[in-house]
């Protein structure tokens, strides 16, 4: 089958890093500078991606693979293959059209990217708030109020009091 295919289409024999050159009677030609073909049988080589401005090069282009970009410090990637760079914010903030804004009360963001999310509603799970939420951290839910009734306390009991008249050594 491979042989039949190559007899029908000479371009199918062109390996990665080359293209099927119509100007040369369909013989395989190496990709010109700053272009690549990552698969065989290509009729053109693709222009290498250039990581400019807020993008920086994570992997150089070669004749068989495209360049890969990431973002300069203070920015993070968005989209497939890091097609966009978005500004970082601080924890406790989210990026709006007007820039980084603090999370509203009742919401938090523990990352430098993304949006502020509501604190967990502990009562929905029948639990109580053990640690209050902040702009940077979600609340920590603890045992349900019922669990804290006398005799069922999960809180560590206080240390026994010393007997009177005994001073520490």
């Amino acid at each position: 089958f491979e042989r039949t295919r190559s007899l029908q289409d000479p371009c199918s024999n062109c390996p990665a890093g080359t293209f099927c050159d119509n100007n040369r009677n369909q013989i395989c030609s190496p990709c010109p500078p700053n272009s690549f073909s990552s698969a065989g049988g290509q009729r053109t080589c693709d222009i290498c991606r250039q990581c400019k401005g807020v993008f920086r090069t994570r992997k150089e282009c070669s004749s068989t693979s495209n360049a890969e970009c990431d973002c300069t410090p203070g920015f993070h990637c968005l989209g497939a293959g890091c097609s966009m760079c978005e500004q970082d914010c601080k924890q406790g903030q989210e990026l709006t059209k007007k820039g980084c804004k603090d999370c509203c009360f009742g919401t938090f963001n523990d990352q430098k990217r993304g949006i502020c999310r509501p604190w967990t509603n502990c009562s929905l799970d029948g639990k109580s708030v053990l640690v209050n939420g902040t702009k940077e951290r979600d609340v920590v839910c603890g045992p349900s109020p019922a669990d804290l009734s006398p005799g069922a306390s999960s809180v560590t009991p206080p240390a026994p009091a010393r007997e009177p008249g005994h001073s520490p050594q």
Partner: nanobody, 111 residues
Amino acid sequence: AVQLVESGGGLVQPGGSLRLSCAASGNIFSIRVWSWYRQAPGKQRELVAWFAWDNIAHYTDSAKGRFTISRDNTKKTMYLQMNSLKLEDTAVYYCNSGDSWGQGTQVTVSS
């Protein structure tokens, strides 16, 4: 323009070796892709081995493991070391860079 002259072809028995040379003259410093092609009687010219613009050596399936491309920039020369030659390697071998071609050197593998 760049001028290319191949040498080193000849008659060799199956299993033998040859080393082809391609001497370049002219403004070679702008050239970033160097290739060896071959053309067997009655067949289309085909790519054998090449230095890509990223300086990495590449080989087509027919050359992998048997042929080695190299170059000496100080001598403006590219080489093709061909080992374990087969009858089907018989062809005229051409050196290429950009639009420049050498005149070719004949390689005949015969017992």
